[in-house]
């Protein structure tokens, strides 16, 4: 009997009954590799409370239709007095990724699962060339799910200091270049999930092979390897590979972009801080409200619910969409469909489709985005059940008493997209969010200007236009409300710019939209300040101009006009300079833009070396100087000694050339003992120095060896910029 869903065959999948603390392992084509469940178990249940295992589905006793898979067992069970056998039932629905099996419920006899997956679609439009499972459960059975990050077309550009290359990645699946309008990706080979673009050429540097792994609490890892035998000529004989580490942030924040943290011999290490790496209870709710302590979020959309037969109406050219949230649309056409989103053809109102049902609802908050998803609508020709995705945006001045109205933005493969500006989507305050700008490969980061809490103080703008008696004080913070301290104590709580004079304080604008690159400068617009007459609100523009080396200068008031409705400040600061890579000498490196100077020479050992021990090896390492330890070679900056026989390898010749990019200081030792491979590649060492104000000198931590480079991480206070 042929496997019904071959795309799902290569993996053992997991699902969890959180209420009863039960973990299920599912292999739909073969058997799970768990001795306690027997040799032919396709669905193995692990009860963590009782520490017992039971097979609840046998691979031999499988029956399948296009949308249902049943695994029976020979174990009897009692259900309402009838003699049944224990079985598992998996209902398949068409989805846009491989998806995840979800536990639905269990009776004495039947364990029910539901699985939305590309494997169940009638047509192949969503199917990938290569895709791997994109979720994982942690030791507390909490789900970390990166499926929402998977791009169905296009890719993510990895932030890197190299202007000559661009690394594009997708998450858990290959990059679909055919459906992507971007010309840069057109040349990427099929199957690649990591595509390196150099000039007009594109190279496959990694394809998905294994599923997502949890390496430790709130850190997930995805590894891509290049499958083809042919080597790339710029990789020095090495096979390319990509490791993406997804990190759950410790506080609420807008998603960052993936960032390249190490690159040598075509081994790319990427770190991506994203709330999708956090466990899913933080991010999702089946109701209309959501709160998460870790993200400092509290959202309630129930005030948007319409009752008494009315609905929101959104115009979609050929169709009208009737929507409700937190309840079904009570429109006559849509009766009995239990639809939250109802699609009606303008030219023929008898053609009515449910574009998502209200009891199939997921409210999701992640990386600063609030999304309401209604799925389980009427089927399309592909077999995919229609679904609707409503992206909410915070707008405290939305019409309709702050409720606002949904706007249809488009349809892709039977998924309908809406945006909805409403005050009910406002999440406390957008602190630490999007405090930078991008312009192609150039990145700008204003976070050095943010003042978070006392003892820090607000920036005070210079205003030379007034006499002392009528003096106004202008307090400014960047990407953050002003701190209510000193003369700004009476400022409105959510003001990002505040004016204080003898009559009191005024809100000149809130941080609502992120900075933008404009005409060579960075523009930051604060809006929705206090009323200034004629139904208008005060707005402030801050133009930030690059001034290398200066993080001290204050902003200057340039103009105020429109009857006190508009203020303009100019700020010459290093924070407005493009992030660039800098090389240094003599164990120092100078970040010319920010004006930071780093000197790691206090870490250099004049005699001896730092010793790091692992089970099999001792590593001796020095900073900007040679290790003077027998049996290490006298000019090596790092060396490896086998504990068993004292065999020694030079891991690179010492030098004092530090490099710096976006807060990361690195030291590279090259030209060590060659490997016994055909290219005789010399061993190398990469040390990444990171700021830890508590650490003093600190110490090296061995990370891993990736082919020919030994990676160390070193937290030290000497890598911290002096606070301005």
């Amino acid at each position: 009997q042929a496997a019904p869903f071959p795309e799902l065959c290569s993996y053992t999948w997991e699902a969890v009954d959180t209420k009863n603390n039960v973990l299920y392992k599912i292999n739909i084509c073969g058997s799970v590799d768990i001795v306690q469940c027997g040799p032919s178990s396709a669905v193995c249940m692990h009860d963590l409370k009782t520490r017992t295992y039971h097979s609840v589905g046998d691979s031999v006793l499988r029956s399948a239709t296009r949308s249902l898979l049943e695994f029976n067992t020979t174990v009897s069970c009692d259900q309402q007095g009838t003699n049944h056998r224990v079985q598992s039932s998996i209902a398949f629905l068409c989805g846009k990724t491989l998806g995840t099996p979800e536990f639905v419920t269990a009776t004495e006899c039947v364990h029910y699962f539901e699985w939305r997956t590309t494997a169940a679609c009638k047509k192949d439009i969503f199917k990938a060339n290569k895709e791997v499972p994109c979720y994982v459960f942690d030791e507390e059975l909490r789900k970390h799910d990166l499926n929402p990050l998977i791009k169905l077309s296009g890719a993510y550009l990895v932030d890197d200091s190299d202007p000559d290359t661009s690394l594009f990645i997708n998450v858990c699946r290959d990059i679909d270049t055919l459906r992507d309008p971007g010309s840069q990706l057109r040349a990427c080979p099929p199957g690649t999930a990591a595509c390196l673009v150099r000039g007009h050429q594109a190279f496959d540097v990694g394809q998905p092979r294994d599923g997502l792994k949890l390496v430790r609490k709130d850190r997930l890892v995805l590894s891509y390897v290049r499958e083809e035998a042919g080597k790339l000529d710029f990789c020095d004989g090495h096979s390319p590979a990509v490791t993406i580490t997804f990190v759950c942030p410790s506080e609420r924040r807008e998603g960052t972009i993936p960032k390249l943290t190490a690159k040598s011999n075509c081994r790319y290490e990427i770190e991506w801080i994203t709330e999708y790496a956090c466990h899913r209870d933080y991010l999702e709710s089946k109701t209309c409200s959501l709160s998460g302590e870790q993200q400092d979020v509290s959202i309630d959309l129930t005030p948007l619910a319409q009752s008494g037969g009315s609905s929101y109406i959104s115009d979609g050219k050929e169709y009208l969409f009737y929507l409700n949230v937190c309840g079904e649309t009570e429109i006559q056409f849509c009766n009995k469909k239990q639809a939250a989103v109802c699609q009606v053809k303008k030219s023929d109102t008898s053609q009515v489709k449910a574009a998502g049902r209200y009891h199939n609802q997921t409210l999701r908050y992640s990386d600063g985005d609030l999304t309401l998803i209604y799925f389980g609508g009427d089927e399309c020709s592909s077999g995919f059940q229609r679904m609707s995705v409503i992206n909410f945006e915070c707008n405290k001045t939305a019409g309709n008493d702050g409720k606002g109205t949904p706007v249809f933005t488009g349809e892709v493969d039977c998924t309908y997209f809406f945006t909805w500006d409403t005050e009910y989507a406002c999440v406390k305050e957008k602190e630490d969010l999007l405090c930078g700008a991008t312009d192609g490969k150039k990145r700008y980061d204003l976070s050095a200007l943010v003042r978070h809490a006392e003892p820090e103080q607000n920036w005070e703008a210079v205003d030379g236009s007034q006499t002392e008696t009528e003096k106004k004080h202008f307090f400014i913070n960047i990407c953050h409300r002003v701190l209510q301290e000193g003369k700004a104590r009476g400022c409105p709580e959510d003001a990002a710019v505040c004016a204080v004079d003898k009559n009191g304080s005024k809100n000149l604008g809130k941080f609502i939209s992120s900075p933008m690159k404009e005409k060579g400068n960075i523009q930051l617009s604060y809006s929705d300040g206090d009323d200034c007459g004629h139904g208008k609100k005060i707005k402030t523009n801050i133009t930030l101009v690059c001034k290398p080396g200066d993080l001290e200068s204050a902003p200057v008031l340039r103009t105020s006009g429109e009857g006190g409705c508009f203020y303009e400040f100019e700020w010459h600061t290093a924070a407005a300079c493009v992030l660039s890579k800098t090389e240094g000498e003599n164990c120092t490196v100078f970040d010319s833009q920010a004006g930071f100077s780093f000197d790691l020479s206090p870490l250099t050992k004049k005699n001896g070396a730092y010793k790091v021990e692992t089970k099999k090896y001792d590593f001796y390492i020095n900073v900007c100087g040679p290790v003077s330890v027998s049996p290490c070679q006298p000019d090596s900056g790092a060396c490896q000694v086998a504990k068993s026989d004292e065999k020694t390898w030079n891991l690179g010749l010492s030098n004092a050339k530090l490099s710096y990019y976006d807060g990361m200081i690195q030291l590279n030792y090259r030209g060590g003992t060659p490997y016994n491979n055909e290219r005789h590649t010399p061993r190398a060492t990469l040390i990444t120095f990171l700021c830890d104000r508590d650490a003093g000198v600190g110490f090296p931590e061995y990370q891993e060896e990736d082919n020919s480079t030994y990676n160390f991480r070193w937290y030290t206070s000497y890598a911290c910029p002096e606070e301005p």
Epitope: K217, V612, E701
Partner: nanobody, 114 residues
Framework: EVQLVESGGGLVQAGGSLRLSCAAS????????VGWYRQVPGKERDVVAS???????YYGDSVRGRFTISRDNAKNTMYLQMNSLKPEDTAIYYC?????????WGQGTQVTVS
């Protein structure tokens, strides 16, 4: 809330041994770089020994060969076995964990070698 609690300090004669323990709550020891630091009055805290999530270890020059760091992931506890103690090992010993959120310190336990 993250809490680190040290125990096992005390008075011991030169040449003797002590075993310090650090019990953690609110954090998984096995998933983070953790270590022991010590401080004598008027000086900065110095690293004594450290162990990463990948089990690589680091020892300060003055204790290498005499002290051993270990951890029991099941008990979420870290240990420092101190042998051949010397009077210059007298200090307050602190347990520390570094996570992606920042670093956490215990309150410290006094070790006095006479």
């Amino acid at each position: 809330e993250v809490q680190l609690v040290e125990s096992g300090g005390g008075l011991v004669q030169a040449g003797g041994s002590l075993r310090l323990s650090c019990a953690a709550s609110g954090i998984i020891f096995g998933a983070n770089t953790v270590g022991w630091y010590r401080q004598v009055p008027g000086k900065e805290r110095d690293v004594v020994a450290s162990i990463t999530s990948g089990d690589s270890t680091y020892y300060g020059d003055s204790v290498r060969g005499r002290f051993t760091i270990s951890r029991d992931n099941a008990k979420n506890t870290m240990y420092l076995q101190m042998n051949s103690l010397k009077p210059e090992d007298t200090a307050i010993y602190y347990c520390r964990a570094r996570t992606t959120d920042g670093s956490y310190w215990g309150q410290g336990t006094q070790v006095t070698v006479s």
